[in-house]
Amino acid sequence: CKAMHVAQPAVVLASSRGIASFVCEYASPGKATEVRVTVLRQADSQVTEVCAATYMMGNELTFLDDSICTGTSSGNQVNLTIQGLRAMDTGLYICKVELMYPPPYYLGIGNGTQIYVIDPEPCPDSDF
């Protein structure tokens, strides 16, 4: 009957190529076989979905083909990678975990990871 706790890092710095990775870990109150993981972005109290994937425990995490997210799962831990980030995408990224099956359903929401994205300086034109 316990609530589900979700842990994620407080801060992550995206790479110069606009890629950010972080681990989302959840303490499962039950033996879930089907789990849904959603990444949400919170900006100015507005929340929008970045990507979502449902997976069966023991199987791989599969996002849609056009998703900017990829990930792998291991037990109660999900390794998430968000690609194509730009400076304007800097913000709080929340990991939401739902235990979909078997009953009961559980919802877990992390405190969010602040992802900082710095656009690379353009290379100066070089004369040959």
Epitope: C1, K2, A3, M4, H5, P29, E34, R36, T38, L40, V47, T48, E49, A52, T54, I94, K96, E98, M100, Y101, P103, P104, Y105, Y106, L107, I109
Partner: antibody, heavy 118, light 108 residues
Framework: QVQLVESGGGVVQPGRSLRLSCAAS????????MHWVRQAPGTGLEWVAV????????YYADPVKGRFTISRDNSKNTLYLQMNSLRDDDTAVYYC???????????WGQGTMVTVSS | EIVLTQSPGTLSLSPGERATLSCRAS???????LAWYQQKPGQAPRLLIY???SRATGIPDRFSGSGSGTDFTLTISRLEPEDFAVYYC?????????FGPGTKVDIK
């Protein structure tokens, strides 16, 4: 704008069936869990059922289990509640509600009245 | 099943006064999954507070939520005429999702 509109309520005899619909607009329907909540006259809110995302996972409150079926058609942006073997105590206003990104029921329909009476 | 109890059942106050509504859970509820709703006669419920303390979009700042564990509070700092209604708490962290019986705030 984001909106939910229920329909299908009415007066029905005990033991009969009724199907409620909830038409959604203004948001990506398939990205949200959808609930039915009811309110008997003069009483509080009672959660009835939920259906998640693609429609594979569904959960019901004990009083309706085995009698009610929740479903959705994501291509039509519509939520349904098939109510069979209706009883007097199913008389209520039935609301559909969206499970928001952070879980709370953030958007509600206006409700549709179901009266079970002989 | 998590049972929610609300008190008082009815709160009779005057406009401008402060309203304090209580919601108690039969077992610990994470504050991330506790909501408050307002319902006026003949209308659908409206989300006021989610995550125990975060105001929903468009909700005035006279509404505030607090609490953790099994005890939660909704406070209306200065009652406006439009605030007289029934208020429900709800837990949405696990199924079955449950509502409290409601507190009616009426005009004294």
């Amino acid at each position: 704008q984001v909106q939910l509109v229920e329909s299908g309520g009415g007066v029905v005899q005990p033991g009969r069936s009724l199907r409620l619909s909830c038409a959604a607009s203004g948001f990506t329907f398939s990205s949200y869990g959808m609930h039915w909540v009811r309110q008997a006259p003069g009483t509080g809110l009672e959660w009835v059922a939920v259906i998640w995302y693609e429609g594979r996972n569904k959960y019901y409150a004990d009083p309706v289990k085995g009698r009610f079926t929740i479903s959705r058609d994501n291509s039509k942006n519509t939520l349904y509640l098939q109510m069979n073997s209706l009883r007097d105590d199913d008389t209520a206003v039935y609301y559909c509600a969206r499970a928001g990104d952070l879980g709370a029921f953030d958007i509600w329909g206006q409700g549709t009245m179901v009266t079970v009476s002989s | 099943e998590i049972v929610l109890t609300q008190s008082p059942g009815t709160l009779s106050l005057s406009p401008g006064e402060r309203a304090t509504l209580s919601c108690r859970a039969s077992q610990s509820v994470s504050s991330s999954y506790l909501a408050w709703y307002q319902q006026k006669p003949g209308q659908a419920p409206r989300l006021l507070i989610y995550g125990a303390s975060s105001r929903a979009t468009g909700i005035p700042d006279r509404f505030s939520g607090s609490g953790s564990g099994t005890d939660f509070t909704l406070t209306i700092s200065r009652l406006e005429p439009e605030d007289f209604a029934v208020y429900y708490c709800q837990q949405y962290g696990r199924s079955p999702f449950t509502f409290g019986p409601g507190t009616k705030v009426d005009i004294k």
